[in-house]
């Protein structure tokens, strides 16, 4: 990375991440400097790479909704780290401006 700039996720992973190994997620938004919208899922094991996923996919929406209604045991890491789980080719987004962190909200049971 040049001068602390972080890569944007430029390609969705073909792999699906099991719900129970995900700690949290954050959104990558094109309006904030990245070329595609994406959801970056953070595994519970911090040694594992984030996974870049298509926000329009059913399984992604299910997992996001599940995380949104689950009280967060710990906050996800700050910033927008590289997604080593998906290939990245092309233009970089500068810094972490392309990522928006979404923490799990403390909501009551049920919708």
């Amino acid at each position: 990375s040049d001068g602390g700039a972080q890569d944007c996720c430029l390609k969705y992973s073909q792999r699906k991440i099991p719900a129970k190994v995900v700690r949290s997620y954050r959104k990558q938004e094109p309006s904030l400097g990245c070329s595609i919208p994406a959801i970056l899922f953070l595994p519970r094991k911090r040694s594992q790479a984030e996974l870049c996923a298509d926000p329009k996919e059913l399984w992604v929406q299910q997992l996001m909704q599940h995380l949104d209604k689950t009280p967060s045991p710990q906050k996800p890491a700050q910033g927008c780290r590289k997604d080593r789980g998906a290939s990245k080719t092309g233009k970089k987004g500068k810094g972490s401006k392309g990522c928006k962190r979404t923490e799990r909200s403390q909501t009551p049971k049920g919708p």
Epitope: K16, P18, A19, K20, K56, E57, L58, W59, Q61, Q62, L63, Q65, H66, K69, T70, G110, P111
Partner: antibody
């Protein structure tokens, strides 16, 4: 209050077609995935199909793949199930259900589809 | 796709605790839910995310999920609990599967 109301069921001959509708009210329809679940007379529940919030991503049970098509119209708060090449074994009460993460939190009362000659 | 197997029936006297099992290959790696269905009615979720109880569901309903078995426990069964119970789970496809259902009879 949150409500799902199915319609469109009825008697149809084998090989025929039918389109079911599910009218949603009382919640922001485009913020939830939706599913169809069926129950043959005296039998258990069988998941049929699901669709993502904006309709981009769809999933089907093997038993209906290639014959049934799920869709939604978020401007009308309505979920659909187009059923083609119907068989006797498709006879069931069809429920629409709202997905909330990994479970179904709201169900309609169902509409009966009978496939018989 | 995962197959979920439930006992066809279980019974218990009022006040007794009953358990209904739901067996499937590595179901513990997915989230399980449980639905109660009374005759002529639509199903109602009683447990979701393995062990969470929706508001309005009595505390006597609880769940667990580990390995190859998810379990619904009703502690102190009451007459109004008599119904069919179905377990359910999503796999990563994502497709959903229900168990065959268990008829609970309160003696």
């Amino acid at each position: 209050q949150v409500q799902l109301v199915e319609s469109g069921g009825g008697l149809v001959q084998p090989g025929g077609s039918l389109r079911l509708s599910c009218a949603a009210s009382g919640f922001t329809f485009n913020s939830y995935s939706m599913s169809w679940v069926r129950q043959a007379p005296g039998k258990g529940l069988e998941w049929v199909s699901a669709i993502s919030m904006e309709g981009y991503s769809k999933s089907y049970a093997d038993s209906v793949k290639g014959r049934f098509t799920i869709s939604r119209d978020n401007s009308k708060n309505t979920l659909y199930l187009q059923m083609n090449s119907l068989r006797a074994e498709d006879t069931a009460v069809y429920y629409c259900a709202r997905g909330y993460g990994y479970y179904f939190d709201v169900w309609g009362q169902g509409t009966l589809v009978t496939v018989s000659s | 796709d995962i197959e979920l197997t439930q006992p066809p029936s279980v019974s218990g006297s009022p006040g007794q605790s009953i358990t209904i099992s739901c067996s499937g290959d590595s179901i513990g790696s997915q989230y399980a839910s449980w639905y109660q269905q009374k005759p002529g009615q639509a199903p109602v979720v009683v447990i979701y995310d393995d062990n969470e109880r929706p508001s309005g569901i009595p505390e006597r309903f609880s769940g667990s999920n580990s390995g190859n078995t998810a379990t619904l426990t009703i502690s102190g069964t009451q007459a109004e609990d008599e119904a069919d119970y179905y377990c359910g789970s999503w796999d990563s496809n994502p497709t959903h599967v229900f168990g065959g259902g268990t008829k609970l009879t309160v003696l």
